[in-house]
């Protein structure tokens, strides 16, 4: 696993401990909480980061209305079970034997049950809608400048391939970033949209996961873009399965 060899640190994940005892005597960085070695040349999976922390059509200018099947992460933080590759296990349980199924970004997609609950597969989140509200500014941002800056951010800071940023919508003060990545589109080495969205979310909150970098300084044509609210919606390849009781609540 690559890391900054000279001083053995992990540029993409500060929630690690690094030492020169990896294969071939190379620097190896282990995620806090799980102890799994991480690849410091790319983003760390959201599952390992969570564990460490506890331990619309492309050119449309209108805002997207999240579908009825869109999930919002209302459950907050939990200590997840990750598979040997660092992905979320389909079934998550807490210490009181309450279990539930999650999607590939770790968001609950079923009612909670007991240890008999079955989650046959990890359902992929293929569409993420990041809904931002920016602080008041003298005037609206130029949409194409804003679009370009956010695409640059995801490409350069989060190493997300540009084809996965499906659209950037803007109706002052609301900005929406759409990320799309089907199972068939994601090649080996591609950053997962769920991981990119999580890094972005933490950056926006002023909790950057990057080692030694300053916080996120978003500017559009020199004008600071300051976010005051963030909502993230997750759409899965297979719709979630909640009881009617929850849907009407």
């Amino acid at each position: 696993h690559t890391a900054a060899q000279d001083n053995c640190t992990c540029p993409t994940n500060k929630m690690t401990v690094c030492s020169p005892d990896g294969p071939g005597g190379r620097c190896q960085c282990r995620a806090l909480g799980s102890g799994m070695a991480v690849d410091c040349s790319t983003l760390t999976s959201k599952c390992l980061l969570l564990k460490a922390r506890m331990s619309a059509p492309k050119n449309a200018r209108t805002l997207v209305r999240p579908s009825e099947h869109a999930l919002v992460d209302n459950d907050g933080l939990y200590d997840p079970d990750c598979d040997p590759e660092g992905r979320f296990k389909a079934r998550q349980c807490n210490q009181t034997s309450v279990c539930w199924c999650v999607n590939s970004v770790g968001v609950r997609r079923t009612d909670k049950g007991d240890l008999s609950l079955r989650c046959d597969e990890l359902v992929r989140t293929h569409h993420i809608l990041i809904d931002l509200r920016h602080r008041p500014t003298a005037g609206a941002f130029n949409h194409s400048d804003l679009d370009a800056e956010l695409r640059r951010l995801f490409r350069e800071r989060y190493r997300l391939h540009p084809k996965f940023v499906a659209a950037v919508h803007y109706e002052q003060p609301t900005i929406q970033i759409e990320l799309r990545q089907n199972t068939s589109q994601k090649a080996a080495g591609d950053v997962d949209i769920g991981d990119a969205a999580y890094y972005f979310e933490r950056d926006i909150k002023g909790e950057s996961l990057f080692q030694g970098r300053g916080g996120l300084d978003l500017r559009v044509r020199g004008e600071p873009l300051q976010v005051e609210r963030t909502l993230i919606y997750y759409l899965d390849e297979i719709p979630p399965k909640f009881s009617m009781k929850r849907l009407t609540a």
Partner: antibody
Framework: QVQLVQSGAEVKKPGASVKVSCKAS????????IHWVRQAPGQGLEWIGT????????VYNQKFRDRATMTADTSISTAYIELSRLRSDDTAVYYC????????WGQGTTVTVSS | EIVLTQSPATLSLSPGERATLSCRAS??????IHWFQQKPGGAPRLLIK???ESISGIPSRFSGSGSGTDFTLTISSLEPEDFAVYYC?????????FGQGTKLEIK
Amino acid sequence: QVQLVQSGAEVKKPGASVKVSCKASGYSFTTHWIHWVRQAPGQGLEWIGTIFPSNAYAVYNQKFRDRATMTADTSISTAYIELSRLRSDDTAVYYCARASYFDYWGQGTTVTVSS
Amino acid sequence: EIVLTQSPATLSLSPGERATLSCRASQNIGTSIHWFQQKPGGAPRLLIKYASESISGIPSRFSGSGSGTDFTLTISSLEPEDFAVYYCQHSHSWPFTFGQGTKLEIK
């Protein structure tokens, strides 16, 4: 050359505590994990936990989380493990070892728990 | 936690013969497996790291192979001093664990 030198044998009564030290030399103490492993008489090897000396980040085997405490003093390149509320089945040889693949080991410290 | 299962528990061979020791992991651990030799009254000694990387000072008759869940330690031609207990250990994630050991004895 790399060396890990452990403190001497200990005899303790049930319920007491024991603290074993491991003095490192011949390498940069702060940049390598120190692991603690024990071996009961006639048994296999059991991982107790590990500590990263530079920031004292410690990880424990669940089995020992309530009773073991690992610390490190970087000023004298020494790691410690303290085991409390000793029981007779804690009788074992306790080893410290370096790095994720345990390339260097201490000579072992025999801890006997007997009333 | 990851469980390492070593086989056989005991292996009886003669000097000069080839020894093949197995270690199976309960889940994919890549190449994060290490092999140790332990003689009575002594500390374990590292023989192979990361499944197949050789260790300075260890005779070339010791070699390792495998990845994922199945790993092998091979001693190409046994010397009298090789009769000991052998352990595998993983460093994939916490907690690290050891196999239960394989005792290599003289036939």
